[in-house]
């Protein structure tokens, strides 16, 4: 007996061929001998089966001696043995219908679990193998689980169901809801305007939710909420904002915050959380602000940075076009009795300059100028 695998919701075509290449009488029945469809002359006839409104045939093939049974919008319970009667002979086809669905939703927050459940007909013993968009293979029986979803898990999951040496392939589109970056660092000179951007790693038709930016300044003992906002159909509206600093927020996605000026007291790290409607859990993005200040007080030229810097970052003071006078893996460096000229304060990582501040040192009889 021929075995055909079908997918829930799909259309399947079961073939039946006569030796004579012409239109002759045929009938399709199920295992209970209930007539599904057949022909009477050149016309289709239908029986009293439960498939009545979902069964059809390809009439254009009848003259070639082919009498297929087409079943639309397949259901698991359509799994059965179908019998084609033509020319005093019977052809049997066993149809097995499978369904593969994702738990609750295909839009999941980063870190959540994905469970894929296989619906199968009684008596079948299928095996399932799924391949994630990043090429990771998982195997299982009736259910497959992937914990701690990552951003790279977004995309099409391809799952193969194997039964009786036949296979049927399912494609499930999974969207991992997350920010494009888990963390970012902004390096600014004191007084500069600061732009924070929080691009999302997914696109959906309608995006509704609410968010908040909590900030832990390096100099402060506790964190504080800088801004709260609502998101409705991709439109952003500010609910509450602190007076110091007075952040500004863009009205459209991607989420965009502007800090009028970088000051040492703002240096630190923040956590932007976004709670999406109908989703349990929140999206998070960490943002860090490093602020640099170069000053000259009497005979002391000082360069300082505030905020979360890694221990391997190098802070240097050098006279333009000269070797660094001082270079340390510390958050402050200084030069006593600096020579006149344009001094550069550099924050660098393995030779790559992250932040630079210039200060002009005048001969000792005059006051310094900061460009």
């Amino acid at each position: 007996k021929k075995v055909v695998l079908g997918k829930k919701g799909d259309t399947v075509e079961l073939t039946c061929t006569a030796s004579q290449k012409k239109s002759i009488q045929f009938h399709w029945k199920n295992s209970n001998q209930i007539k599904i469809l057949g022909n009477q002359g050149s016309f289709l006839t239908k029986g009293p089966s439960k498939l009545n409104d979902r069964a059809d045939s390809r009439r254009s093939l009848w003259d070639q001696g082919n009498f297929p049974l087409i079943i639309k919008n397949l259901k698991i319970e359509d799994s059965d043995t179908y019998i084609c009667e033509v020319e005093d002979q019977k052809e049997e086809v066993q149809l097995l219908v499978f369904g593969l669905t994702a738990n609750s939703d295909t839009h999941l927050l980063q870190g959540q679990s994905l469970t894929l459940t296989l619906e199968s007909p009684p008596g079948s013993s299928p095996s399932v193998q799924c391949r994630s968009p990043r090429g990771k293979n998982i195997q299982g029986g009736k259910t497959l689980s992937v914990s701690q979803l990552e951003l790279q898990d977004s995309g099409t999951w391809t799952c193969t169901v194997l039964q009786n040496q036949k296979k049927v392939e399912f494609k499930i589109d999974i969207v991992v809801l997350a920010f494009q970056k888990a963390s970012s660092i902004v390096y600014k000179k004191e007084g500069e305007q600061v732009e924070f951007s929080f691009p999302l790693a997914f696109t959906v038709e309608k995006l509704t939710g609410s968010g908040e930016l909590w900030w832990q300044a390096e100099r402060a003992s506790s964190s504080k909420s800088w801004i709260t906002f609502d998101l409705k159909n991709k439109e952003v509206s500010v609910k509450r904002v602190t007076q110091d600093p007075k952040l500004q927020m863009g009205k459209k996605l991607p989420l965009h915050l502007t800090l009028p000026q970088a000051l040492p007291q703002y240096a630190g790290s923040g956590n932007l959380t976004l709670a999406l409607e109908a989703k349990t859990g929140k999206l998070h993005q960490e943002v860090n602000l490093v602020v640099m200040r170069a000053t000259q007080l009497q005979k002391n030229l000082t360069c300082e940075v505030w905020g979360p810097t890694s221990p391997k970052l190098m802070l240097s003071l050098k006279l333009e076009n000269k070797e660094a006078k001082v270079s340390k893996r510390e958050k402050a460096v200084w030069v006593l009795n600096p020579e006149a000229g344009m001094w550069q304060c550099l924050l660098s990582d393995s030779g790559q300059v992250l932040l630079e501040s210039n200060i002009k040192v005048l001969p000792t009889w005059s006051t310094p100028v900061q460009p």
């Epitope: 239109s23 002359g41 050149s42 016309f43 254009s60």
Partner: antibody
Framework: QVQLQQSGAELMKPGASVKMSCKAT????????IEWVKQRPGHGLEWIGE????????SYNEKFKGKATFTADTSSSTAYMQLSSLTSEDSAVYYC?????????????WGQGSTLTVSS | DIKMTQSPSSMYASLGERVTITCKAS??????LSWFQQKPGKSPKTLIY???RLVDGVPSRFSGSGSGQDYSLTISSLEYEDMGIYYC?????????FGAGTKLELK
């Protein structure tokens, strides 16, 4: 081009039988079903049945079983319909039509019709 | 048997007017529907098959549409020679059945 030529008008007595013809030209007669349709004023169009000339296979509307009989002569490319035990209810215009190949086209060509009058 | 309900049963229209005739099947007929035109004393002439396919030689002002149970025939700009009776036919299932017809007359 495809043409279906039907026999002329008939005046018959109740209880008699009549055989009308439909001669096909312009295509391979054996390969296409010939349909028969009845039209009576105030009753619209009614499908009587069909014949596949090549095999002689026939199919009848339940309502016309025992009333109509189809035959075909492939040598003359002519299909026939015989109506028996005539009554006034059989007075109508009868059309033959060709069933489109592959069954997608419905009835693609029609004859000009044969008028039958049953009267004593 | 599948019942075909055609409407209106008769209608008056002016030359140049857009005319629509509808046919409703008692069940899904999978677009196996034809439209015919019949003039007094003449045999039916096929205009449309498979719900929307125009027969060769039929003017492009005729068009068919629909799916499932509901179908329509539209004449975009009525001409004098379009007067007559229009019928629909379902040929999805045995036995094929016709609509009762729509008589189209000049206003």
């Amino acid at each position: 081009q495809v043409q279906l030529q039907q026999s002329g008008a008939e005046l018959m007595k109740p209880g008699a039988s009549v055989k009308m013809s439909c001669k096909a030209t312009g295509y391979t007669f054996s390969n296409y079903w010939i349909e028969w349709v009845k039209q009576r004023p105030g009753h619209g169009l009614e499908w009587i049945g069909e014949i596949l000339p090549g095999s002689g296979s026939t199919s009848y509307n339940e309502k016309f079983k025992g009333k109509a009989t189809f035959t075909a002569d492939t040598s003359s490319s002519t299909a026939y319909m015989q109506l028996s035990s005539l009554t006034s209810e059989d007075s109508a215009v009868y059309y033959c039509a060709r069933r489109g190949y592959g069954y997608d086209e419905g009835f693609d060509y029609w004859g000009q019709g044969s008028t039958l009058t049953v009267s004593s | 048997d599948i019942k075909m309900t055609q409407s209106p049963s008769s209608m008056y229209a002016s030359l140049g007017e857009r005319v629509t005739i509808t046919c409703k099947a008692s069940q899904d007929i999978n677009s196996y529907l034809s439209w015919f035109q019949q003039k007094p004393g003449k045999s039916p002439k096929t205009l449309i098959y498979r719900a929307n396919r125009l027969v060769d030689g039929v003017p492009s002002r005729f068009s068919g549409s629909g799916s499932g149970q509901d179908y329509s025939l539209t004449i975009s700009s009525l001409e004098y020679e379009d007067m007559g009776i229009y019928y629909c036919l379902q040929y999805d299932e045995f036995p094929p059945t016709f609509g009762a017809g729509t008589k189209l007359e000049l206003k």
